[in-house]
């Protein structure tokens, strides 16, 4: 049966040029996470397998950094980088979890803006 | 052109060791990891590691991670592998093979590495 | 990690001849599969990337397709230099190999 549970930092913002960390965190399990796979939309951006390390996609070598953690760093954000990503958690013997995370990417002042009258 | 060319057959006893050597050309070989993988007979592939050759960080799948030594030589684009403590079931052709993200692209031809007493 | 089961394992096969290799995972591979071509004492050679993305060179006879568990490479019209061993290979959940598929001549 599967016990765990996946927390993420759910819908973020940040600004168009700045860097973002994506994280998520698996919790109220005992599983043995294999490998982490991280996905925007489609595609595949990185992944991190437990004996043998990181791995990133080519298409986003240069904007894409391993960590921390199990977390996903994405750099030079432009407006075309707001969307869904998924951390996907395989797990043995849980099988497979998957977390949601939404980012928006706004132009600075917009960014600032919000930032300002955030609700807690 | 890419090219990944290995070290000739060898023949060990049980016990000794063996280094295998593959040497890069074609590309910068620091931009990518190298695999090391083998095919025992009518077995598939497996993975033994992966070193990254900009910092010599290696890693290991579990069943080789107190036998297998992984290295670089970047000045003369060459990674090399060891495996220690040699056994019969160890008899295989060995690859190494670079990765280009998720996937192996290009691959050296294999060295048959013969483990009999 | 995800096993990879290819049939057949071997197959006999004449010049011309349309020619079906499936790769099945034991779990779901998301796509994320890739097809070898391999001939004795040569390196592998890439030939579809991500289920059915054809490397650069290969010809276009090759293609593959697939989702979930279950993906195939297709030979439209076998030709002479076709004849060889081909196997699968997934990073959805570890990095793993199908156990390879012969392909002879009848």
């Known amino acids: 049966m599967m016990t765990g549970t996946i927390e993420t930092t759910g819908n973020i913002s940040a600004e168009k040029g700045g860097s973002i960390i994506l994280q998520c965190h698996l919790s109220s399990t005992t599983a043995q996470v294999t490998q982490v796979n991280w996905e925007q939309q489609d595609q595949l951006l990185a992944i991190c397998n437990a004996d043998l390390g990181w791995h990133i996609s080519p298409s986003f070598k240069d904007r894409v950094a391993p960590g921390p953690g199990l977390g996903l760093t994405l750099q030079s954000l432009t407006v075309n980088d707001t969307g869904e990503y998924f951390c996907i958690y395989h797990t043995y013997p849980d099988g497979t979890y998957t977390g949601r995370i939404f980012l928006e990417v706004l132009e600075s002042s917009v960014a600032e803006h919000g930032a300002r009258f955030q609700i807690p | 052109e890419v090219q990944l060319v290995q070290s000739g057959a060898e023949v060990k006893k049980p016990g000794a060791s063996v280094k295998v050597s593959c040497k890069a050309s074609g590309y910068t070989f620091t931009e990518h990891s190298i695999y090391w993988l083998r095919q025992a007979p009518g077995q598939r592939l497996e993975i033994i590691g992966r070193?990254?050759?900009?910092?010599?960080?290696?890693y290991f799948v579990d069943k080789f991670k107190n036998r297998a030594t992984i290295t670089t030589d970047t000045s003369a684009s060459t990674a090399y592998m060891e495996l220690s403590s040699l056994r019969s079931e160890d008899t295989a052709v060995y690859f190494c093979?670079?990765?280009?993200?998720?996937?192996?692209?290009?691959w050296g031809q294999g060295t048959l590495v013969t483990v009999s007493s | 990690d995800i096993q990879l089961t290819q049939s057949p394992s071997f197959l006999s096969a004449s010049v011309g001849d349309r020619v079906t290799i499936t790769c099945k995972g034991s779990q779901n591979v998301n796509k994320y599969l890739v097809w070898y071509q391999q001939k004795p004492g040569k390196a592998p050679k890439l030939l579809i990337y991500s289920t059915d993305n054809l490397q650069s060179g290969i010809p276009s006879r090759f293609s593959g397709s697939g989702s979930g568990t279950e993906y195939t490479l297709t030979i439209s019209s076998l030709q002479p230099e076709d004849f060889a061993t081909y196997f699968c290979?997934?990073?959805?959940?570890?990095?793993?190999f199908g156990q390879g598929t012969k392909v002879e001549i009848k």
């Open positions: 290979y997934q990073y959805n959940n570890g990095f793993t």
């Open positions: 093979a670079r990765i280009d993200g998720f996937y192996f692209d290009f």
């Open positions: 070193i990254d050759p900009k910092n010599g960080r290696t």
